[in-house]
């Protein structure tokens, strides 16, 4: 293990399209991988008229955009599909939306997932 790096060994798993995708609907996903590859957790969700709908959660392949992120935070401004990734066991259990705006002060929109 690299000092200061959070190893991801398992992530919260959820798939809204589990029947079509032939997966489980919910659970814990173990994240295996090559020694030289990092694994991350992720969450994707939609905001439909103020209601949070989780699309998928699980393990995410080695991705520099996820390195050293202990919290799962989406920073893009009003995406159609929200996405965040992080490092550390079950770090995708909670995810949040903090849009990076140039002028206005960013507002916190923490999200506690409640799978249906």
């Amino acid at each position: 293990a690299i000092l200061g790096r959070s190893e991801t060994q398992e992530c919260l798993f959820f798939n809204a399209n589990w029947e079509k995708d032939r997966t489980n609907q919910t659970g814990v996903e173990p994240c295996y991988g090559d020694k030289d590859k990092r694994r991350h957790c992720f969450a994707t969700w939609k905001n439909i008229s103020g209601s949070i709908e989780i699309v998928k959660q699980g393990c995410w392949l080695d991705d520099i955009n996820c390195y050293d992120r202990t919290d799962c935070v989406e920073k893009k401004d009003s995406p159609e599909v929200y996405f965040c990734c992080c490092e550390g066991n079950m770090c995708n259990e909670k995810f949040s939306y903090f849009p990076e705006m140039e002028v206005t002060q960013p507002t916190s929109n923490p999200v506690t997932p409640k799978p249906p």
Partner: antibody, heavy 120, light 107 residues
Framework: QVQLVQSGAEVKKPGASVKVSCKAS????????MHWVRQAPGQGLEWMGF????????SYAQKFQGRVTMTRDTSTSTVYMELSSLRSEDTAVYYC?????????????WGQGTTVTVSS | DIQMTQSPSSVSASVGDRVTITCRAS??????LAWYQQKPGKAPKLLIY???SLQSGVPSRFSGSGSGTDFTLTISSLQPEDFATYYC?????????FGGGTKVEIK
Amino acid sequence: QVQLVQSGAEVKKPGASVKVSCKASGYTFTSYRMHWVRQAPGQGLEWMGFIVPSGGSTSYAQKFQGRVTMTRDTSTSTVYMELSSLRSEDTAVYYCARVSRYAPEPMDVWGQGTTVTVSS
Amino acid sequence: DIQMTQSPSSVSASVGDRVTITCRASQGISRWLAWYQQKPGKAPKLLIYAASSLQSGVPSRFSGSGSGTDFTLTISSLQPEDFATYYCQQAFSHPWTFGGGTKVEIK
């Protein structure tokens, strides 16, 4: 090394069936989904569906529903794709492709392709 | 189904040129996008996954960017072995779909 080896070229008559095999080696066969993609001459890539080798469950593109059957034999680490009621438009190269275990599920290893020609 | 639209359908370029290919999804797919390279008579080869992550063994002159609906594949300095057809593909929802392809030809 990780490898997918497909069966040889086939020539079939319209209305017949074809069964293409894809033998996996160099990794744990049951840990990775296998997808099938085809490519008609001079055309782009078309996704057909996938099989989950561990349990055998499948999901097919609507276009092929009722005509395609994907199966697997875990004892030989082989997946099969059978396409029935063949027509001339099914003339294509058929590829099997292993999909990474985790999101966003890229197709990281491909077979060499099997040419299927449908002609009367 | 999610439609993937690639442009241009073909591009003529010289060795050393910078080449940019775009791919647009008909609806948001977050970062569930991969890019493949295919040479005549060969199987496709994975170049980029997760919109911007380089697959092991792929030269660093290839790069990907984008998120949501708009994506780009860039070859920073075209090499002789890069003349091929490139496809984008979404894996966000079934059925998985490919772009129509972009053929990179020698000028």
